[in-house]
Amino acid sequence: IWSAVFLNSLFNQEVQIPLTESYCGPCPKNWICYKNNCYQFFDESKNWYESQASCMSQNASLLKVYSKEDQDLLKLVKSYHWMGLVHIPTNGSWQWEDGSILSPNLLTIIEMQKGDCALYASSFKGYIENCSTPNTYICMQRTV
């Protein structure tokens, strides 16, 4: 069963989110389940490291963008949120928390600031930001 859920604080328009765990999940209570991923948008502003710790404490990680098709709800996300993308100064690469290197196919990086962390914005954009700047954040948990 699908329900058109309008989450005004999170998304720019109506987003289809499944409500039954038989189609998606299981996810932690009150998290959004979408195409075999669990997401939670946290309103409190934390720096990147605190955001990462918060996600880890809930057995999750910061958002990883791995597929536009599977994560098409991210196209509509409002505002800017920490995701799990960091610059590794030792090798110069931009990597996800799991060590995989960001593919330019998945995110267009916009270099507004100097920094080693990145904020997710709508339409698969990533904005470079200083890791110590407080921002809201998105946690993600894979269900499969």
Partner: antibody
Framework: QVQLVQSGAEVKKPGASVKVSCKAS????????MNWVRQAPGQGLEWMGR????????HYNQKFQGRVTMTVDKSTSTAYMELSSLRSEDTAVYYC??????????WGQGTLVTVSS | DIQLTQSPSSLSASVGDRVTITCRAS??????LAWYQQKPGKSPKVLVY???TLADGVPSRFSGSGSGTDYTLTISSLQPEDFATYYC?????????FGGGTKVEIK
């Protein structure tokens, strides 16, 4: 196997427009940016721009801004590049190129566009 | 927009020589650099991506290195089939560009 098949050679008059097509097969068309690159006779490669077939987002080389339009037809997995207000300096081979994870991993065979009065 | 300056624009070398081509970016491109080989009348072919990873099927005599703004393609022992033009290209941010190319000719 991945294939990018481009339309045939074109001869155009100065001031006219040209539209080159690139039919993709062998991969999920909407998952990878499609790029257009040109090469004038005896010259180097010049990136013209790219389009995301997923949502038709485009980024163009500033040099071509206002003259180039990139589009896709998802139903036929075909990308198009239209260049307007042609001049003799636009005589070149035009390539489409699929963005792999970290490089242009597949290229079309090229389309020669000749601009001559 | 980040520009790439490739050098030299051409070089003459003999079979067995070690050849080095450099590519300098006008800003940090964070290893988002690929190297291509192009032969006359043919489409380019990727050799190296992420600055140092060899593409599938590319002989091990090719190698890439560098970080930040300075990158290098090295051919450890030039073979007859390596005489071609080589291009670097970056994928950082929204606008992607090629270097001017390096033509490797037979001495």
């Amino acid at each position: 196997q991945v294939q990018l098949v481009q339309s045939g050679a074109e001869v155009k008059k100065p001031g006219a427009s040209v539209k080159v097509s690139c039919k993709a097969s062998g991969y999920t068309f909407t998952s990878y940016w499609m790029n257009w690159v040109r090469q004038a006779p005896g010259q180097g490669l010049e990136w013209m721009g790219r389009i995301d077939p997923y949502d038709s987002e485009t980024h163009y080389n500033q040099k071509f801004q206002g003259r180039v339009t990139m589009t896709v037809d998802k139903s036929t997995s075909t990308a198009y590049m239209e260049l307007s207000s042609l001049r003799s300096e636009d005589t070149a081979v035009y390539y489409c190129a699929k963005m792999g994870d970290y490089s242009f991993d597949y290229w079309g065979q090229g389309t020669l566009v000749t601009v001559s009065s | 927009d980040i520009q790439l300056t490739q050098s030299p624009s051409s070089l003459s070398a003999s079979v067995g020589d070690r050849v080095t081509i450099t590519c300098r970016a006008s800003g940090n491109i964070h290893n988002y650099l690929a190297w291509y080989q192009q032969k006359p009348g043919k489409s380019p072919k990727v050799l190296v991506y992420n600055a140092k990873t060899l593409a599938d099927g590319v002989p091990s005599r090719f190698s890439g290195s560098g970080s930040g703004t300075d990158y290098t393609l090295t051919i450890s022992s030039l073979q007859p089939e390596d005489f071609a033009t080589y291009y670097c290209q970056h994928f950082w941010s929204t606008t992607w560009t090629f270097g001017g190319g390096t033509k490797v000719e037979i001495k």
